[in-house]
Interface confidence: low
């Protein structure tokens, strides 16, 4: 902790300005009034403080605002944001996208994914939902950050906003997040024609159920293998060889490259070998011809 001392009269601080860079840590602690600091936060980022000096300033603000900083302070944190932990940020209430933009800019190039994720979470909570303006800000200033939100937070996205989400914004989304986003995307793009619909829905397909994937296989979409590999395992397993062939079109040859990887491997194990042979790709591991397939899950459900 910073040592408590009395401020020498000649060091008294009436303005947050460049002279403070010459103050030692204990002098900053003793001489800077926290309320003055909060009122003049917008000046802090223009002054080349050391990380040690920023620690003292943060300590000052923490003492003044133990329940969390007000947004007027948060907006002007500048490089002081780099000192914040996720626990600090969880105490904040942020509603302004200008605040979000300012802090996202500061965080660029620093390993702050946990802090940024928490900040975005606070913005969504503060604004009540993940609206279009917030999504636009995230896609412009923090590509990939959308996926840092929990499925619960993503559930507040109105379908009308989904059109603002770009494929690269979903690169880091996990299955649970896509499970939430896919139905919204399906709703948002439902009035589009087949090919346009597929282009739009493709990044969200990691959340699609089997019946939707089956429906796509009837629409000559020629799904690329990268998209196929991101489909849920449970959505792929019930597909027939004919359906997969229709779904992938000319990309079906890629199954050979991916035959050892899920979900392709798991799907192969569920197919009859003679069906797989019709693809002419030399896929191995299907159910040998003549074997009877018992679906034990159905039998258990009946007993």
């Amino acid at each position: 902790d910073v040592e408590r001392t009395t401020c020498p009269p000649e060091k008294e601080v009436h303005e947050i300005d460049e002279s403070l860079i010459f103050y030692k840590k204990r002098e900053l602690e003793a001489c800077v009034d926290a309320a003055l600091l909060a009122a003049q936060m917008d000046r802090v980022d223009a002054i080349p403080f050391t990380y040690e000096q920023l620690d003292v300033l943060k300590h000052k603000l923490d003492e003044l605002y133990p329940q969390g900083y007000p947004e007027s302070v948060i907006r002007h944190l500048g490089h002081l944001f780099l000192k914040m932990s996720p626990e600090d940020i969880r105490k904040w209430n942020v509603t302004s996208l200008e605040t979000l933009k300012a802090l996202l800019k500061v965080s660029k190039g620093h390993e702050m994914s946990a802090q940024v994720a928490t900040l975005i979470d606070r913005v969504v909570v503060g604004r009540g939902q993940l609206d279009k303006d917030t999504v636009d800000t995230l896609t412009a200033f923090c590509p990939g950050c959308l996926c840092s939100l929990s499925p619960e937070r993503l559930s507040s996205v109105p379908p009308s906003v989904i059109g603002a989400v770009r494929p690269q914004d979903l690169d880091t989304c996990g299955p649970r997040q896509l499970d939430v986003l896919y139905p919204k995307a399906r709703l948002a793009f439902q009035n589009m024609s087949g090919s346009e619909y597929f282009v739009k829905i493709r990044p969200f397909l990691g959340g699609a159920p089997t019946e939707d994937v089956k429906a796509l296989s009837q629409q000559n979409v020629s799904m690329d293998l990268a998209t196929f590999m991101k489909l849920r395992r449970e959505a792929v397993l019930p597909l027939t060889v004919a359906e997969v062939q229709k779904l992938l079109g000319p990309h079906v040859e890629g199954l050979k490259v991916e035959e050892q990887h899920s979900p392709v491997r798991d799907w192969i194990l569920k197919q009859r070998q003679d069906d797989l042979d019709t693809l002419g790709l030399g896929l191995q591991g299907g159910i040998p011809n003549g074997y009877l397939i018992l679906d034990l899950s159905v039998r258990e459900a009946l007993s």
Epitope: K108, E111, K132, P143, C147, R166, Q168, T172
Partner: antibody
Framework: EVQLVQSGAEVKKPGASVKVSCKAS????????MHWVRQAPGQGLEWMGN????????YYNERFMSRVTMTVDKSTSTAYMELSSLRSEDTAVYYC??????????WGQGTLVTVSS | DIVMTQTPLSLSVTPGQPASISCKSS????????????LAWYQQKPGQSPTLLVY???TRESGVPDRFSGSGSGTDFTLKISRVEAEDVGVYYC?????????FGGGTKVEIK
């Protein structure tokens, strides 16, 4: 097919303003950011700024901040870039370019602006 | 601003031979959240507008011949042309699309011997 068609060449006097237009077709205009990039004769590319046609939000390169204004007309799917207080070093080809992500996926044919007294 | 430095300034290549262009950024272009490198490569043929070749440092734009490939991470990036053809003549630019203002390299002129 995505197309960006820009207005014709302009000759301006120092101190004047120029407004270049960029008419977009072949995609949903409000779904993609529009960027403006310029290229002085025989020189490289310089990013001037971008605008979100949906919201009107724009972000300018600080080098041009006091002189550039980017606007859109959603009804005609047209983006505009106005540069004021022109000087001879503003002589360049000005391009509009539609974003793919933050990269520039489609470019207009360019508009030559010549500043000469 | 992020400074992009391209080398060499110009390159004279025999048709069928490979070519390599380097691009270095003054700050990392790797986003720790998405693990994407925010770098694009463009080709500008004489008298034409630039066209996109590669984004995210290594993702080839659709329709771009596979003789073009991008690689690299962080601050060091490379565009390779595996077998240069006559139609590849022009100036090649790298651009960071990580932080505004988005900045371009100075360009590399590729000529045919």
């Amino acid at each position: 097919e995505v197309q960006l068609v820009q207005s014709g060449a302009e000759v301006k006097k120092p101190g004047a303003s120029v407004k270049v237009s960029c008419k977009a077709s072949g995609y949903t205009f409000t779904n993609y950011w529009m960027h403006w990039v310029r290229q002085a004769p025989g020189q490289g590319l310089e990013w001037m700024g971008n605008i979100n046609p949906s919201s009107g939000d724009s972000y300018y390169n600080e080098r041009f901040m006091s002189r550039v204004t980017m606007t859109v007309d959603k009804s005609t799917s047209t983006a505009y870039m106005e540069l004021s207080s022109l000087r001879s070093e503003d002589t360049a080809v000005y391009y509009c370019a539609r974003s793919g992500g933050l990269w520039l996926a489609f470019w207009g044919q360019g508009t030559l602006v010549t500043v000469s007294s | 601003d992020i400074v992009m430095t391209q080398t060499p300034l110009s390159l004279s290549v025999t048709p069928g031979q490979p070519a390599s262009i380097s691009c270095k950024s003054s700050q990392t272009l790797l986003n720790s959240v998405s693990q994407n490198n925010y770098l694009a490569w463009y080709q500008q043929k004489p008298g034409q507008s630039p066209t996109l070749l590669v984004y995210f440092a290594s993702t080839r734009e659709s329709g771009v011949p596979d003789r073009f490939s991008g690689s690299g991470s962080g601050t060091d990036f490379t565009l390779k042309i595996s077998r240069v053809e006559a139609e590849d003549v022009g100036v090649y630019y790298c651009q960071q699309h990580y932080r505004t203002p988005y900045t371009f390299g100075g360009g590399t002129k590729v000529e045919i011997k």
